[in-house]
């Protein structure tokens, strides 16, 4: 009988009593074989995490700084359960920390040294540790101790709990840096008055601070915030401009044989039976002898955590970074005005040796990172180990949900001006051979199907999106007979005409045979009925194009698009008969990076971009023999995105509209997990 | 398509040195990187040291200050002087030129290098 205890740790003795009561409470509602729960108790929070990383507890709820503990090595603890506040339709499990100034002040983020600062109180998230954190590299050597740091960089302070005898400037705008409401500037409330007064040029707060304090829209219309790319906002868009965006409180239990969905079970029934307005004899988020025992008072219930998601991610890469500055306290030694390398991530070995010969050549401007799928190289680029790749449409959509930018576009024709002028796309087209002559864009059913891969433009988003708008269900391993569509799961029947060996089989990386373009359109040739692939696809691979043995044979004339009327065309009439118009591919990093990306990305292609005209004696960056390692094989280069530099304005709304009717049948786990921080 | 047949492996202390050799079967005047890899048992092959047809190198930040790529095109041959060896870099040693190995892994047989007491 597997174990369906979940040891929760307390830690006082207040906690142990509650948790006791928890205990004997859900007994009483739960059956014999449901969760239950057991009590540890612990001196501390650390106490807790070390002992639930040995096995000896299950779950404790920590703060954001108490995860981040959890999450280093040796704990290596993950979340598994967020509390949220406000109401169950609009449910908050974060807060962002926000640098609020007032409206006609004219500087930026990069700006304020030198500028009169208020904060919440020394040592607290939004107030101290986060913006300090994120200015920790430029704050005046010796940063140690940090607090004179501070005092150093700023003209003058109102950091309430300082030590106001040794570091009077921090107390500079309060007198005495009282650490309770006594100070009429602590805490958040008190910060904003700081800024209000005009004893202070910026005040960091939390985003709803200033809507708690200023109730009227005009009156907020007086500030702005602060961006971390050194622009300003209104203090409305605090998702897209703010200094870091914080779990409020999390549960988190082990990374292996964590039990977190008997977690999320015991929590989702105590919810049920004993969340807010629930039950009078015992109340989950209410504390008779404390204050937030084992959960926090304010909670309204618990959402749980999606499984793709470590603490890295759940946190964010902005709190990561300023928290640990300020534990580490290492900077990089290079001015900040340079750019350090941009680290490439690289798709399974075959891209890691092109990556590799890219870095080898651009002499210390490029290093390589290797992740074995999309979604994991995405992930990478967020947390911060590696900075950009070249992402499908399908793929920039999943990295601008996940809080990426794109910075430059794969242009695919030749013109004069290629690097200025980004196109309007390329065409998502069904191919089928000619000798099956019956074979129609409304018979498909019960055939064999070719896929670039699950989640990319042409070879899914597009064609799956059309059929589900058809077929109204995601089934769509039961609509086709069998297929191959890299990245579906493995006992699909959209991976059985896959030609990848072992664990390599229907894997979304160039492992798979049968993946990306060239790969779908071999599929067609060897096994399928219909490939969805790009319009130069045939031209490509055929006519002695592609010298691999399965293509070099190849004739243009033998396979014909399915168009959406019913009817067939020549493979060369893709403009009048495609699926629809699908973004380039394109280039996408963190934000923080965009500019460096741009300008070494740039440099690169002067070097090794088309212009190289012998690749053989010479590194091209845009050629892999039909492979379209790194960057499409056809790229002649990459172009300025101008105004179209965010997610929703470069895909355009048509296909970003297409794409999120397709999520219902998304099995995209890392979507699921950036819409859980960004609904 | 060039071959290419790597030499000069060997067993060796902890602090001591070995000169790996990689020989083509023709010109390498033309190639515009050479490179050598390696492969412990059990792990990912990784790259150890390049060098471009100019000549500008690039190393793993674990071999930095002891291991030097150089390339001699009249003698159509790539070396790695390594130095100060370490246990931790015992493996086989492949070189490649990169011309098949983006779509295929065309890799020679390699060279072992052991160091151990």
């Known amino acids: 009988v597997p174990d369906k205890t979940v040891r929760w740790c307390a830690v006082s003795e207040h906690e142990a009593t509650k948790c006791q009561s928890f205990r004997d409470h859900m007994k009483s509602v739960i059956p014999s074989d449901g969760p239950s729960v057991a009590c540890v108790k612990k001196a501390s929070y650390l106490d807790c995490i070390r002992a639930i990383a040995a096995n000896e507890a299950d779950a404790v709820t920590l703060d954001a700084g108490l995860v981040y503990d959890a999450y280093l090595a040796p704990n290596n603890l993950k979340p598994v359960v967020a509390e949220f506040y406000g109401s169950k339709e609009d449910p908050q499990t974060f807060y962002y920390a926000v640098a609020v100034v007032k409206k006609d002040s004219g500087f930026q983020m990069n700006q304020l040294r030198g500028k009169k600062s208020c904060h919440t109180g020394l040592g607290r998230s939004a107030g101290w540790n986060i913006p300090i954190g994120l200015l920790y590299c430029d704050l005046p050597e010796p940063r140690k101790p940090l607090e004179k740091a501070v005092a150093n960089f700023f003209s003058g302070s109102c950091a309430p709990c300082a030590d106001g005898t040794d570091f009077p400037q921090l107390c500079q705008l309060c007198p005495g840096c009282g650490c309770s409401t006594l100070n009429q500037y602590f805490g958040y409330s008190g910060a904003f008055k700081c800024l209000k007064d005009g004893a202070g040029d910026v005040a960091f707060v939390k985003h709803s601070t200033i809507f708690e304090n200023l109730a009227n829209k005009a009156d907020r219309d007086q500030y702005e915030l602060l961006c971390l790319d050194n622009t300003r906002k209104p203090v409305d868009e605090y998702k897209d401009c703010h200094l870091a965006q914080v779990p409020s409180h999390t549960v988190v239990a082990r990374s292996m044989g964590g039990k977190e969905d008997l977690i999320w079970e015991l929590l989702n029934q105590a919810q049920e039976h004993f969340g807010k307005d629930k039950s009078k004899e015992f109340q989950l988020f209410s504390s008779p002898h404390g204050k937030d025992l084992l959960f926090k008072d304010s909670a309204h219930g618990f959402l749980k955590v999606p499984p793709r998601m470590d603490a890295k991610m759940y946190l964010g890469y902005e709190y990561v970074t300023a928290i640990r500055n300020l534990r580490e306290g290492t900077c990089p030694e290079a001015p900040t005005d340079e750019c350090k390398p941009v680290k490439w991530c690289a798709l399974s070995h075959h891209e890691r040796l092109k990556c590799d010969e890219w870095s080898v050549n651009s002499v210390g401007k490029i290093e390589c990172v290797s992740a074995e799928t999309t979604e994991d190289c995405i992930a990478k680029i967020m947390n911060g180990e590696a900075d950009a790749m070249s992402l499908d449409g399908g793929f920039v959509y999943i990295a601008g949900k996940c809080g990426l930018v794109p910075v430059l576009a794969e242009n695919y024709n030749k013109s004069d001006n290629c690097e200025d002028t980004p196109e309007a796309g390329y065409f998502a087209i069904a191919v089928v051979k000619k000798s099956a002559s019956d074979l129609t864009w409304d018979n498909l059913k019960g055939k064999k199907s070719c896929h670039t891969a699950v989640g990319r433009t042409a070879g899914w988003n597009i064609p799956m999106g059309l059929l589900y708008n058809k077929i109204n269900h995601c089934r769509f391993d039961e609509f086709f007979s069998e297929g191959c569509a890299p990245g579906s799961k493995k006992d699909s029947s959209l991976c059985k005409l896959c030609m990848g060996s072992g664990l390599n089989l229907c894997e979304p990386n160039n492992k798979e045979g049968y993946y990306g373009y060239t790969g779908a359109f071999r599929c067609l040739v060897e096994k399928g009925d219909v490939a969805f692939v790009k319009h130069q696809t045939v031209p490509q691979n055929t006519g002695g194009k592609n010298p691999d043995p399965w293509a070099k044979n190849l004739n243009e004339k033998d396979y014909e698009l399915l168009c959406l009327d019913g009817t067939r065309k020549p493979v060369e009439e893709y403009a009048n008969c495609h699926l629809a118009r699908a973004p380039n591919h394109a280039v996408v990093t963190r934000k923080d990076k965009e500019a460096c990306v741009h300008k070494i990305l740039r440099q690169q292609q002067h070097l090794f971009g088309s212009n190289v005209t012998d690749c053989s004696g010479n590194f091209c960056l845009f050629r892999s023999e039909t492979k379209d390692l790194l960057f499409r094989d056809d790229t002649v280069c990459l172009a300025k995105l101008h105004d179209r530099n965010t997610y929703e304005k470069y895909l355009g709304e048509e296909y970003v509209k297409a794409v999120g009717n397709l999520r219902k049948c998304s099995t995209s786990s890392l979507l699921e997990a950036c819409t859980f921080r960004r609904p | 398509q060039v071959k290419l047949e790597e030499s000069g492996g060997g067993l060796v202390q902890p602090g001591g040195s070995l000169r790996l050799s990689c020989a083509a079967s023709?010109?390498?005047?033309?190639?515009?990187?050479m490179a050598w890899y390696r492969q412990a048992p059990g792990k990912q092959r990784e790259l150890v040291a390049g060098?471009?047809?100019?000549?500008?190198?690039k190393y793993a930040d674990s071999v930095k200050g002891r291991f030097t790529i150089s390339r001699d095109n009249a003698k159509n041959t790539v070396y790695l002087q390594m130095h100060s060896l370490k246990p931790e870099d015992t493996a086989v040693y492949y070189c490649?030129?990169?011309?098949?190995?983006?779509?295929?892994?065309?890799w020679g047989q390699g060279t072992q290098v052991t160091v151990s007491s």
């Open positions: 490649t030129d990169y011309s098949r190995t983006y779509y295929e892994d065309h």
């Open positions: 060098i471009t047809r100019g000549g500008s190198t």
């Open positions: 023709g010109s390498i005047v033309s190639i515009a990187t």
